[in-house]
């Protein structure tokens, strides 16, 4: 594809030299490269009051390339833009700016949040959790026999972790007291199967958070399970402060 060209460039650079350095096809002592060897990109770099032509294998940061039939040319992106598709559309902003729909912004618009890793404005993502799984069998110290009052647990999964400004995740574990008909354990039995049992149901769709007490349990000593529950609650309070996802709750 031939281009019809103005001749001004030649007149502006009368001392055109053919013995050029670094990828130049034609050059001048005063202005450096005037044209490049095939496949190289021509860039005008400002040095003081002078503009020097340089030939590069690809456009530098802050420029985008256009492959014309007769010249591969680099054009400057907007001042706040590091990488761009063209003058109108930035694809990566300079440090301290956030990319939003091809523009570089100091702050993200309302309803969006800054992703400090990608330096883009992104939609706020709230936590999403699955439905509760069924309650586990009533157990005590890992057994399903040899007791009357025990605990049962149910869990749910985090389907979508929240972004920085998103709503935190609700608890993903719930434990509550349960009562079963006491059944003697057979020798060596740990009793994996669920039993017929009466349940103390939590309030309509909600569950009271409480540190497990020993009331109604066979031993007044703190069980490992209760210790674990206490630790999990402490952990959760710390996580709440850190604005992290909450994951465990104990209900009686």
């Amino acid at each position: 594809q031939n281009a019809s060209r103005g001749r001004r460039q030649r007149r502006m650079h009368p001392n055109v030299s053919q013995g050029c350095q670094g990828g130049c096809a034609t050059c001048s002592d005063y202005n450096g490269c005037l044209s490049c060897k095939p496949r190289l990109f021509f860039v005008l770099e400002r040095i003081g009051m002078k503009q020097i032509g340089v030939c590069l294998s690809s456009c530098p940061s802050g420029y985008y390339g256009t492959r014309y039939p007769d010249i591969n040319k680099c054009t400057k992106c907007k001042a706040d833009c590091d990488t761009c598709f063209n003058k109108n559309f930035c694809t990566k902003c300079k440090s301290g700016f956030y990319l939003h729909l091809g523009k570089c912004l100091d702050n993200c618009p309302e309803g969006l949040e800054a992703n400090n890793h990608t330096m883009e404005c992104v939609n706020i993502v709230h936590c999403e959790v699955s439905e509760w799984n069924p309650w586990s069998p009533c157990t005590k110290k890992g057994k399903t026999c040899g007791f009357k009052r025990g605990t049962e647990t149910r869990v749910r999964e985090i389907m979508q972790h929240p972004s920085a400004k998103g709503n935190l995740c609700p608890p993903t574990n719930e434990t509550r007291k349960c009562t079963v008909q006491r059944k003697k354990c057979q020798k060596g039995e740990r009793g994996k199967k669920g039993r017929e049992r009466k349940r103390k149901k939590p309030n309509k769709g909600e569950s009271k958070e409480a540190i497990p007490d020993s009331k109604g349990l066979e031993s007044s000593k703190e069980t490992p399970e209760q210790r674990e529950n206490k630790q999990q609650q402490k952990k959760r309070k710390v996580q709440d402060k850190q604005q992290k996802s909450v994951s465990v709750s104990t209900v009686h």
Epitope: S4, Y68, K87, N88
Partner: antibody
Framework: EVQLVESGGGSVQPGRSLKVSCAAS????????MAWVRQAPKKGLEWVAT????????YYRDSVKGRFTLSRDNTKSTLCLQMDSLRSEDTATYYC?????????WGQGIMVTVSS | DIQMTQSPASLSASLGETVSIECLAS??????LVWYQQKSGKSPQLLIY???RLQDGVPSRFSGSGFGTRFSLKISGMQPEDEADYFC?????????FGAGTKLGLK
């Protein structure tokens, strides 16, 4: 608001000439390469020609080379396409567009009919 | 010149349906691909640039993907206002070339 307004279309006989113009506003005209893209009735888009931002270089598709001449006046923010030796296959809606790798801004288009 | 092969030539979709349009380049064009939407009797409008980046004002149900020679435009949940012609264009080098277009209709 960016506006590109084409004018000068119409019906001509094969072999005759026609000049279509485009008046630009709402953006820095002298910063942009400008192009014409055409669309034959019920057909796809076809790039016709581009003139670079300062007017020093023009590029044409093979089928119009030697017949069409593209020029611009940055002081008036106008673009002109002089079409000579028109053929029936030049019948199309001609769009004026700001060309910066993609065609970011488009005019509403002007119909050119070449028919005997 | 780089040839752009677009498919399908036409398709119709029900409201809410997900639609995909493909574009194939005859040589590697990196991510230098643009998608345009042209509604009946109107001029084309830039929809997606750099293969996957949405132009300001374009609904988020539109998305673009691909790199090299294979590209696609997806509409997740067809809306009445999406009824239009869609064109891909390689912006890798001159001459700029377009796909033949896809006419998207509403069932």
């Amino acid at each position: 608001e960016v506006q590109l307004v084409e004018s000068g279309g119409g019906s001509v006989q094969p072999g005759r000439s026609l000049k279509v113009s485009c008046a630009a506003s709402g953006f820095t005209f002298s910063d942009y390469d400008m192009a014409w893209v055409r669309q034959a009735p019920k057909k796809g888009l076809e790039w016709v020609a581009t003139i670079i931002y300062d007017g020093s270089r023009t590029y044409y598709r093979d089928s119009v080379k030697g017949r069409f001449t593209l020029s611009r006046d940055n002081t008036k923010s106008t673009l002109c396409l002089q079409m000579d030796s028109l053929r029936s296959e030049d019948t199309a809606t001609y769009y004026c567009a700001a060309h910066d790798r993609s065609f970011d801004y488009w005019g509403q288009g002007i119909m050119v009919t070449v028919s005997s | 010149d780089i040839q752009m092969t677009q498919s399908p030539a036409s398709l119709s979709a029900s409201l809410g349906e997900t639609v995909s349009i493909e574009c194939l380049a005859s040589e590697d064009i990196s991510n230098d691909l643009v998608w345009y939407q042209q509604k009946s009797g109107k001029s084309p409008q830039l929809l997606i640039y750099a293969a996957s980046r949405l132009q300001d004002g374009v609904p988020s149900r539109f998305s673009g993907s691909g790199f090299g020679t294979r590209f696609s435009l997806k509409i997740s949940g067809m809306q009445p206002e999406d009824e239009a012609d869609y064109f891909c264009q390689q912006s890798y080098k001159y001459l700029p070339t377009f796909g033949a277009g896809t006419k998207l209709g509403l069932k």
